[in-house]
């Protein structure tokens, strides 16, 4: 289990000509909010298909009213992160859709009106627990800058949040067969599996198969809130009206049956119907032994001579899981270089290479420029698997077919003059400034000496007025 987190940094006009009209006006003030939709794998599904990994909606941003005559700036954003919790393993590869919505706050009949301003989508590889990844996506004339990451919720760790960690019982080393939990070297990998159905929010376990409840929760799976006040009726009013939290009296509430057993109420209690291989009042006892052949895909069964002792499956290469039932995703190691598509054929790995690359792992860079032309005097630059054009002054785009003005985005700071140049642009800095784009004042203060405490920003600082 874990959380995918998305931080929107800015949403505003993209670079280049054709700045979009402001989405709000003095007559129609509005505010933005964002929606993110996540799907596992590198699927190219339609935007309408379900967000199988989860979805989230941001808060509303501050109200914005366009200043007449001013260029559309970056629009004010909602506070905070968008968080998409995931219950199972993090898939490592995922598709995302981020939508920017406008809420108009004029005198609409029947409340505010919503309209979709921009939608961006992409497919990414991402390991859980890694640093924030940054991204810029464009939708028409709009540009969205954002960061994202996936993090595991304790006790889960690892790039897929599938390993569990717990503090060491002995100071020097982990128990037999257990490894230290990188990066938490003071913790040990734990083969700890709580009772099936144990609430991940309100329950925990210190021994496999148990479910212990956090304060305020009860029931065999810690799904029943403990009463916090006296109530009017046996079932009590809802917490929304009085704050009274009362367990429903049904014996099957929260399903006390473990290991996929189904619960049915009896006049005095409950009864569990257990799946094959399990027995006991709550299906908590495994009746499977090595004699039953529980290990799949050629796994070797060890132990489990009688029903009360556990068996362990030692899996052959390429398989994992308590019964060797899962094929190891060897493609998760990303063996294909330069964006190649990995195919696990069982007996072998195969890489399907992008145009411009070859070799068993797509490691050979072919001549990207062979037979490719750049328009308007541009020259072809090799590398990256797709031909790139270095365009002549005044042209841009993939094949140098678009007219471009590198000075349109006001790239020079502090009053520097921008000049279009064959290499892109050149900033001629005002006296007292230097840097590629005049962003560094040589002597930032007019006074000959400063007070000992640094002044921070003052209204008189010359670099403030751009």
């Amino acid at each position: 289990a874990g959380v995918f987190e998305l931080q929107i940094h800015s949403f505003g006009p993209g670079p280049g000509p054709g700045a979009p009209r402001s989405p709000c006006s003095a007559r129609l003030p509005c505010r933005l909010f964002f929606r993110v939709c996540l799907k596992p794998g590198l699927s190219e599904e339609a935007a309408e298909s379900p967000c199988a990994l989860g979805a989230a909606l941001s808060a509303r941003g501050p109200v914005y009213t366009e200043q007449p005559g001013a260029p559309a700036p970056d629009l004010p954003l909602p506070d905070g992160l968008l968080q998409v919790p995931f219950r199972d393993a993090w898939p490592g590869t995922f598709s995302f859709i981020i939508e920017t919505w406008r809420e108009e706050l004029g005198d609409q009949i029947g409340g505010p009106a919503w309209s979709l301003l921009a939608r961006v989508a992409g497919r990414r590889r991402l390991a859980a627990g890694g640093p924030w990844a940054r991204d810029i996506q464009r939708a028409g004339a709009w540009e969205l800058r954002f960061s994202y990451r996936a993090r595991c919720e304790p006790p889960a760790v690892g790039t897929a949040c599938t390993r569990l960690c717990r503090p060491r019982s002995a100071p020097s080393r982990c128990g037999p067969g257990l490894r230290p939990c990188a990066p938490l070297e003071d913790e040990c990998e734990a083969p700890l599996v709580c009772r099936a159905g144990c609430s991940p929010e309100h329950g925990f376990c210190e021994q496999p198969g148990e479910c212990r409840c956090l304060e305020g929760w009860t029931g065999p799976l810690c799904t029943v809130p403990v009463s916090t006040s006296s109530c009017l009726s046996p079932r009590g009013p809802s917490s929304a009206t009085t704050g009274c939290l009362v367990p429903g009296p049904g014996p099957c509430d929260g399903n006390p049956c473990a290991n996929g057993g189904s619960c049915s109420e009896t006049p005095r209690s409950f009864e569990c119907t257990c799946p094959r291989g399990f027995y006991g009042l709550r299906c908590e006892v495994s009746g499977v032994t090595c004699a039953d052949g529980p290990c799949f895909n050629g796994g070797l069964c060890v132990g489990g001579a009688d029903p009360d002792s556990a068996y362990i499956c030692h899996c052959p290469p390429g398989f994992q899981g308590s019964n060797c039932e899962k094929r190891v995703d060897r493609c998760s190691l990303q063996p294909c270089r330069n964006g190649g598509l990995c195919l696990d054929l069982g007996h072998a790995l195969r890489c399907r290479c992008r145009a411009g690359f070859a070799g068993p792992r797509c490691e050979h860079d072919l001549d990207d420029c062979a037979g490719r032309a750049c328009a308007n005097g541009g020259t072809c630059v090799e590398g990256g698997g797709a031909h790139r054009c270095s365009c002549a002054l005044g042209f841009g785009g993939r094949d140098c077919r678009e007219r471009a003005d590198p000075c349109a985005a006001r790239p020079c700071a502090h009053g520097g003059r921008c000049y279009a140049h064959f290499s892109g642009l050149v900033c001629a800095c005002a006296p007292g400034y230097m840097g590629a784009r005049c962003e560094f004042p040589v002597h930032p203060d007019g006074a000959s000496a400063l007070p000992a405490a640094p002044p921070g920003l003052r209204p008189g600082d010359p670099q403030r007025y751009l």
Epitope: H9, D74, R134, A413, A436, E439, Q463, R464, L466
Partner: nanobody, 117 residues
Framework: EVQLVESGGGLVQPGGSLTLSCAAS????????LAWYRQAPGKKRELVAG???????HYIESVKGRFTISRDNAKNSVYLQMNSLRAEDTAVYYC???????????WGQGTLVTVSS
Amino acid sequence: EVQLVESGGGLVQPGGSLTLSCAASGSDVWYLSLAWYRQAPGKKRELVAGISDDGSRHYIESVKGRFTISRDNAKNSVYLQMNSLRAEDTAVYYCYAYSWKTRFPYWGQGTLVTVSS
């Protein structure tokens, strides 16, 4: 807003080395040009070294070949590696960031470097 926190200052002997670090945080750390300035007692604050958001580096003459500025975009940090330090390098060193998002400059609180035997 961008907040800048410097560290790594201290007392060092002439000819010694020191590395200053500056961590940027806040809502506008997306595209920053970063620099180190210094101010000796009774003198103006001056630019020492800068690194633009495209990675190009700029140094004043007196530190070329001795000081190296670098940045780690993943950590939103800038570093100043100072070698062959001289007494005239003694100053309060300030971290500076120019945000291309807000088009505003931001300053750290400063860290004291003293070169003395």
